[in-house]
Interface confidence: low
């Protein structure tokens, strides 16, 4: 019988305590937004806020410019200079709420807590390979702006998410923003609005289109916007919300909001439970029935699939996914089964659900009882009905008015609970090669690098490592640029290969051959490195 | 009901200036664009410009630019078009036409009007 | 600026006929295509905008489709209050700027 080399375990051919250092930028203070933007001459730039100042990196995450965008009320705020001579609102600091591109102009365009979550506008510049910020013009015409109707205030100091969307010549802002009673009474921002940017960019329109919580649930019935994103002829808000206005407050589920890209207006508002499980192979006695529910959404990002993923989601390769990291409750703590959850939910099936909603509101036969919903942003009333009246009139429609959608979306974990204590803080996902990979940061300050599939026992890792010593938690946005994501923890951003950051970590040659391709891995000598790590023979297809 | 009154016929001399006005009612003036367009005698259609009363922003075509002067008063919900140095070249229906949202589209037309120019 | 170029500049047809009408754009223009309707001694109507979308009110018997730079616009089953002369427009950059016109006359 002929001698086989004993097999190495699959967890022991792979070591995660590899130190890989990646390039990073210190930016002064807590990361509290970024951005990337790539030009079409081959220009890119990293735009990194901290407290009262706003960073521009060059591609190599170099400092290209700084500007300061507070205190409030401080000689040296570059950003309130630009508003005219003062006072523009009570001094303080300005923490950055906003930072979005308008990509038609160039430009960047910064809100934040200060000034009444008014917003700035920088045109992009470019200089060479980097990008500087032109002077700052100050979106926020005093004239057109009462406490009562603010189209110029945006942003919320309890968070705002913005989508920017060009529809012909013009920039619609889609904004959806926490409110409070406090909130909402000074200079009375909206929950979800589209706001469009004057050409003279001096601020938004006036009598722009909005929902609000009604004053009378904005104690107990807070919503946080998530994420937000743009694909086909819509955009989406991801919400974490109380599952209902009358109910336990702290009883939680998370919510897809959708809206028209092509018209800006909120008459075809809808939304949608989203329904996350983890579901064992082997269900525990006592454990709930469909598994057990992840209501509360912690990250969230959409993307193309490849091929693999594709053919497991009953999808064809290409298709938007919206991808969701979930937990069980806010304080995201440990239970029983794992700390997070991955859901895959395909836009395609997640707007045919709102539609089939629609119908089941609006066409006849009238299903009694169905209900309208959305009753903290609008009169509670029955479908087909308008809310607040009790029948429709001849010459309105059932459709033009805001709804939640009957049903909900369900799905469960793709990683079959294999994510076990991590807890996930960061998602960003991408398609190399045929192959779909999530990239996760957690809780404890580490990058993980998976390939999305489901049906296995075991997790595929493209890499698992420490961004840095500190140990701080990621956060939660992610932004890419070029054939790199850019992390945020603490006060410092990291710039990580897509394709992961090396090979190092895989311990045998074996292990090392079977990476995937795009990883450009190669056995060296002792070791797996990619080749321009190995002076000496590197070797791709067999092992000595 | 949305409407766009426009100002009756003019007929006035070459080398002179005429101020024509449309006055909207059944929407808020601010919330839209208004366009002026043209057409000339058994001819077509030709956009002259536009503006966004919410700030006062135009854009109008560079030929029409020395001739035409596009303003609006949001008081009175009345949008003008004046023309200068008017030569026989210009005799058209001028019509005023509210924006369809951000499309460039014009979904409410004002009934147009006739300026002749002659001597 | 982008040229509409609009053809045939005139067209008979009969009553119940399907008629097409096309827009060629000098340069890609997107979705970005409105059409109009002006009926003999009358002021122009939207009829169809961002290329394939119904303006309120009009029949479903118009229709529009294309992207890019070619368009057309069909009526089907020609009906005599159709008679009209029929204008394009591209919203996709300043200048706007109009085809020069499809005359629809009945046989």
């Known amino acids: 019988e002929d001698w086989q080399c004993p097999r190495t375990p699959y967890a022991a051919s792979r070591d995660f305590d590899v130190k890989y250092v990646v390039p990073s930028f210190s930016a002064g203070g807590l990361v509290q937004a970024m951005v990337t933007y790539e030009g079409d001459r081959n220009e890119s730039a990293v735009f990194v806020a901290i407290r009262n100042r706003l960073h521009v990196l060059g591609p190599d995450l170099k400092s290209v410019q700084s500007l300061a965008t507070g205190p409030a009320g401080d000689p040296g705020c570059q950003t309130c200079a630009a508003c005219g001579p003062g006072p523009h609102g009570p001094p303080g600091d300005t923490d950055t709420k906003v930072l979005v591109l308008d990509p038609a102009l160039p430009a960047l365009v910064s809100c934040g807590s200060s000034l009444q979550g008014r917003c700035f506008l920088h045109d992009l510049e470019p200089q060479g390979t980097a990008v500087h910020l032109a002077a700052p013009a100050c979106l926020f015409s005093a004239h057109h702006n009462r406490p009562d109707d603010c189209p110029d205030c945006v942003a919320s100091p309890l968070g705002t998410r913005v989508t920017v969307v060009e529809q012909g010549q013009a920039s619609y802002f889609y904004v959806a923003s926490s409110l409070d009673a406090a909130v909402a009474a000074s200079f009375s921002p909206r929950s979800v609005s589209i706001r469009r940017l004057k050409a003279d960019a001096s601020g938004f329109a006036p009598g722009f289109v909005a929902l609000s919580v009604l004053p009378k649930h904005l104690v107990s019935y807070s919503i946080e916007y998530v994420h937000s994103f743009h694909t086909g002829a819509f955009v989406y808000f991801l919400t974490v919300q109380p599952a209902s206005v009358t109910d336990d407050p702290s009883a939680l589920h998370t919510r897809l909001a959708r809206l028209s890209a092509t018209e800006p207006e909120l008459g075809d508002y809808r939304e949608l439970v989203l329904d996350c499980r983890f579901a064992p192979k082997r269900r525990r006695r006592g454990a709930p029935e469909g598994g057990q529910p992840y209501p509360v959404l912690r990250v969230a990002h959409s993307a193309p699939v490849g091929a693999q993923l594709a053919t497991e989601l009953s999808i064809a390769e290409g298709q938007e996914v919206l991808f969701g990291v979930f937990v069980t409750g806010k304080d995201g703590g440990p239970g029983v089964g794992p700390n997070s959850v991955v859901c895959a939910f395909p836009i395609d099936l997640l707007d045919t659900l709102i539609d089939e909603g629609v119908e089941r509101c609006c066409e006849s036969p009238v299903h009694p009882g169905l209900r309208r919903g959305l009753d903290f942003f609008q009169s509670p009333s029955f479908c087909p009905n308008p809310p607040g009246l009790e029948a429709l009139s001849p010459n309105t429609s059932c459709r033009h008015f805001p709804l939640l959608v009957s049903s909900s979306f369900s799905r469960v974990d793709l990683f079959n609970g294999l994510l076990g204590p991590v807890q996930v803080t960061a998602l960003y996902v991408t398609r190399l090669d045929n192959v779909t990979v999530a990239h996760m940061g957690t809780m404890d300050g580490r990058i993980l690098q998976v390939e999305l599939v489901r049906s296995l026992n075991y997790l595929l890792y493209v890499s698992n490592f420490s961004l840095g010593d500190s140990g701080q938690p990621v956060q939660r946005d992610v932004s890419r640029l070029g054939d790199h994501l850019l992390f945020a923890s603490g006060d410092q951003v990291f710039q990580v290969p897509i394709q992961g950051p090396g090979c190092r970590h895989f311990l045998t040659c074996g292990r090392c051959l079977r990476a995937w391709h795009f990883m450009g891995c190669g056995w060296c000598g002792n070791m797996c490195g990619q080749q321009k790590e190995c002076p000496g023979s590197w070797q791709q297809d067999h092992c000595p | 009901e949305v409407q766009l009154q426009q100002s009756g016929a003019e007929l006035v001399k070459p080398g002179a200036s005429v101020k024509l006005s449309c006055t909207t009612s059944?929407?808020?003036?601010?919330?839209?664009?208004i366009h002026w367009v043209n057409q000339k005698p058994d001819q077509g259609l030709e956009w002259i410009g536009r503006?966004?009363?919410?700030?006062?922003?135009?854009k109008s075509d560079p030929k029409f630019q020395v001739k035409a002067t596009i303003t609006v008063d949001t008081s009175s919900n009345t949008a003008y078009l004046q023309l200068s140095s008017l030569t026989s070249g210009d005799t058209a229906v001028y019509y005023c036409?509210?924006?369809?949202?951000?499309?460039?589209?014009?979904?409410?037309w004002g009934q147009g009007t006739s300026v002749t120019v002659s001597s | 600026d982008i040229q509409m170029n609009q053809s045939p500049s005139s067209l008979s047809a009969s009553l119940g006929d399907t008629i097409t009408i096309t827009c060629h754009a000098s340069?890609?223009?997107?979705?970005?295509l409105n059409w109009y309707q002006q009926k003999p001694g009358n002021i122009p109507k939207l009829l169809i905008y961002?290329?394939?979308n119904l303006h309120t009110g009009v029949p479903s018997r118009f229709s529009g489709s294309g992207s890019g730079t070619g368009f057309t616009l069909t009526i089907s089953s020609l009906q005599p209050e159709d008679i009209a002369t029929y204008y394009c427009?591209?919203?996709?950059?300043?200048?706007?700027?109009f085809g020069g016109g499809t005359k629809l006359e009945i046989k």
């Open positions: 961002k290329a394939s």
């Open positions: 503006i966004d009363p919410a700030d006062g922003n135009r």
């Open positions: 427009q591209q919203g996709q950059s300043y200048p706007l700027t």
């Open positions: 036409a509210r924006g369809y949202g951000n499309l460039n589209a014009m979904d409410s």
């Open positions: 059944g929407f808020n003036i601010i919330d839209t664009y």
């Open positions: 340069q890609n223009i997107n979705v970005w």
